[in-house]
Interface confidence: medium
């Protein structure tokens, strides 16, 4: 059960796991949640009557019974973690703490004019889990402004302390603001040949590189694959580090591949979710519970549904026995993968879906797309909004995407004229307009925020955020698209959609159903040459054929234009303006989003 | 101490090609990466490319993607932009940098050259 409160003057007593140091109980329950194991912690604050020794102390739990005895001790605080929930859970934490001294390894010291600048320093660097920044009201004079970047092993503090006149904070990676750069290939027939800081047993490499991402040390990769040659190596996956954050040497190893952390653009990739099978393949552990089970999806739900399970193996019923069900083997280990990975004994094997929870709900696998045709099936554009405007009458006005669950982006021309956001609605999860009647429910608008560098479509920056006044409920027909990531510059997006109730050609009228047309992005050097009269900046992307025939138009305004890329769909332009609507050689304009994720961010994560 | 000292920029027509060199001396194994930046007339810095110096790993800003290239020459310590297909949007300051991140944010970079102006007319 769910239990997000957390309990003052209350310690729980036994089953400690390990003891972390944290700034606040409330980053203690997210440490907690994150921990393979963990389910309960105490944390002790500071307090007069408590040992200083002892202040911040955040000691992870687990029980069989997933509770423990309660005992009143002053200055304690415990609380559950958020595993047992079924809500959207980040690591990001913005807090920054006064007058804490948060211990790590001092790898990098340097003045900056602020605590702000020093943590945009350690959310830069590859190496910076936290940092401490001396103020320039701190005693002493030759420490005022300098920020310490550092690290540890574990990527929380090793102690924490009262310390006058200095703050600390976390790196933020975790929320989407890093600049380093995304290297997301896996490289084949590849060792890198740098210091291993862990080695966990993995599947396949995709796994690995999630484990690499999630593991606060880990900057790269090798895995050795299941044909390795050295037999006690096979499905080795190897997490590693250096001390310019890259791998010094690249090894030509046939059977290995490696890769990198994508820990600076987590928000856009599955991280937790292993959601594949992994057939005649056995992953061993510590037996929690072996179940009857009539498929292995349905013992991925069962292992889903024991909040202790990490993994499992199922084998299939022999011929009539057991009315045909197979055993469901529920496991754990310390670390969240098997402790040894076995092939050719007939089970299928795979993770617990709790944990998909921890990844963007963005990244979530979508029903699989209708090819050909050009009218969309329900579901199958879940971010896709209509706006209307009801003055003078109610009409379509405008496409946009979902981006948060109270967050709608969409192009900054759609609101010329637009007085007031009271006159907006939000419709989501819609197929048809016909379906909008008087009783259909919509989204109030709270906020339009407009790109204040914003005059007109052809001039750029047209790009608008609408914050909702309630939040939306995340469901298989309405729910977020993934930002593209700052650090993820390489990507050539190939397979991508534009979509919207829009004109079907430049004399038409809105559509009812839903549109869709699979459109090849257009360097911008070839838009330039379409687009003479025009300027074509890097804030812009154009897509098009170039014989025409398919293009957004005139309605479809501020909606997606939508890339799949490792099966995550990326909001990679907002649909603006164009000459004509799918006219030869006149690819349509929008607005490149990477461009804008830190407005984005700014805007939407302000406090 | 690491010096980087830049050149190859100068004055073209759109659509023609220039070749930037970056040649860095003193204390260069300390450096991971090497990456150009560049700065338009009253315009912040802007990354342009960047090279992982040991295993060669690169990356673009998509503006200049299909256009430009990054390369090395390790025996000489340099980095060289092949820059084709110039447009006037590319008329700015270009600043070669050395430092242990491979990263988009000029903090990242601890040292650099004193840049070479690239003016594109059209």
């Known amino acids: 059960e769910c239990v997000t409160q957390l309990l003052k003057d209350t310690c729980f007593e036994g089953g400690d796991i390990t003891t972390v140091f944290t700034p606040s109980a409330k980053y203690c329950q997210v440490v907690c949640t994150y921990h393979p194991r963990c389910l309960l912690f105490t944390f002790t604050a500071e307090s007069p009557s408590e040992d200083p020794t002892r202040w911040f102390t955040c000691v992870l739990k687990d029980s069989v019974t997933e509770t423990l005895p309660r005992v009143n001790r002053t200055a304690a605080i415990s609380g559950y973690s958020f595993k047992q929930c079924s809500h959207q859970i980040s690591a990001c934490n913005k807090d920054i703490y006064v007058d804490l001294d948060m211990k790590g390894i001092n790898y990098n010291s340097s003045v900056a004019k602020s605590a702000q600048e020093c943590q945009e320093r350690c959310t830069d660097d590859v190496h910076c889990h936290f940092f401490t920044y001396a103020t320039r009201q701190f005693p002493s004079l030759e420490h005022r402004n300098i920020c310490l970047l550092k690290h540890t092993q574990t990527g929380t503090p090793t102690r924490i302390t009262k310390l006058d006149k200095v703050v600390s904070g976390f790196s933020l990676k975790s929320c989407a603001l890093s600049n380093l750069a995304c290297i997301r290939d896996i490289f084949p027939n590849t060792v890198f040949a740098d210091s291993n800081i862990d080695s966990v047993m993995a599947p396949d490499a995709f796994v690995c590189g999630r484990i690499c991402t999630h593991h606060p040390g880990c900057l790269f990769f090798t895995f050795f694959s299941q044909e390795w040659p050295k037999e006690s190596q096979r499905n080795l996956c190897l997490l590693k580090t250096s001390e310019s954050g890259l791998p010094s040497t690249r090894i030509k190893k046939s059977k290995a591949l490696s890769g990198f952390s994508l820990q600076s653009c987590r928000h856009s990739i599955p991280v937790f979710c292993h959601s594949s099978f992994y057939h005649d393949t056995d992953f061993l552990g510590e037996e929690l519970d072996i179940v009857a089970a009539k498929s292995h999806e349905a013992c991925q739900k069962l292992c889903t549904n024991a909040v202790r399970c990490q993994f499992f193996t199922y084998t299939p019923a022999q011929a009539s026995c057991n009315e045909g069900k197979g055993k469901c083997y529920l496991k754990l280990s310390s670390n969240g993968s098997p402790t040894k990975i076995l092939h050719g004994r007939g089970g299928i094997s795979g993770y617990t879906l709790r944990l998909c929870k921890m990844d963007n709900e963005c990244t979530t696998k979508i029903k699989p797309r209708i090819v050909g045709g050009t009218a969309s099936v329900r579901g199958e554009w879940p971010w896709q909004v209509t706006l209307h405007t009801t003055s003078p009458t109610q009409r379509h006005l405008c496409g946009g995407s979902i981006i948060g669950n109270q967050w709608i982006l969409t192009a900054a021309h759609c609101f010329y004229g637009v007085e007031s956001p009271k006159i907006l609605r939000v419709y989501s999860g819609i197929l048809n307009q016909s379906e909008i009647k008087e009783d259909t429910s919509f989204f109030g608008v709270q906020e339009i925020i407009i790109h204040d560098q914003y005059k007109m479509a052809e001039s750029g920056y047209d790009i608008a955020l609408l914050k909702l006044e309630t939040t939306v409920n995340y469901t298989d027909s309405q729910r977020p698209i993934c930002l593209p990531s700052k650090g993820d510059r390489n990507v050539i997006y190939t397979d991508c959609w534009v979509t919207g109730w829009g004109y079907r050609k430049l004399r038409d009228k809105i559509q009812n159903t839903l549109q869709k047309a699979k459109i090849p992005l257009v360097t911008n050097e070839e838009c330039q040459k379409r687009y003479r009269g025009h300027k074509i900046t890097h804030k812009m992307i154009c897509a098009g054929y170039r014989e025409g025939g398919k293009d957004a138009c005139k309605g479809d305004s501020g909606g997606p234009l939508s890339c799949k890329h490792n099966e995550v769909w990326h909001l990679v332009g907002i649909t603006s303006w164009g000459e004509g609507c799918a006219q030869r050689e006149r690819p349509g304009v929008y607005t490149n989003v990477v461009e804008y994720v830190d407005w984005i961010l700014e805007k939407t994560q302000a406090v | 101490q690491v010096q980087l000292v830049e050149s190859g920029g100068g004055s073209v027509q759109a659509g023609g090609s220039l070749r930037l060199s970056c040649a860095a001396s003193?204390?260069?194994?300390?450096?991971?990466?090497m990456a150009w930046f560049r700065q338009a007339p009253g315009k912040g810095l802007e990354g342009v490319s960047l090279?992982?110096?040991?295993?060669?790993?690169?990356s673009y800003t998509d503006s200049v993607k299909g256009r430009f290239t990054i390369s090395q020459d390790n025996s000489k310590n340099t980095v060289y932009l092949q820059m084709n297909s110039l447009r006037a949007e590319d008329t700015a300051v270009y600043y070669c940098?050395?430092?242990?991140?491979?990263?988009?944010?000029?903090?990242?970079?601890?040292?650099w050259g004193q840049g070479t102006l690239v003016t594109v007319s059209s």
């Open positions: 090279i992982a110096t040991s295993s060669g790993f690169i």
């Open positions: 940098a050395a430092g242990t991140q491979f990263s988009w944010s000029p903090g990242s970079y601890n040292y």
């Open positions: 003193g204390y260069t194994y300390s450096m991971g990466a």
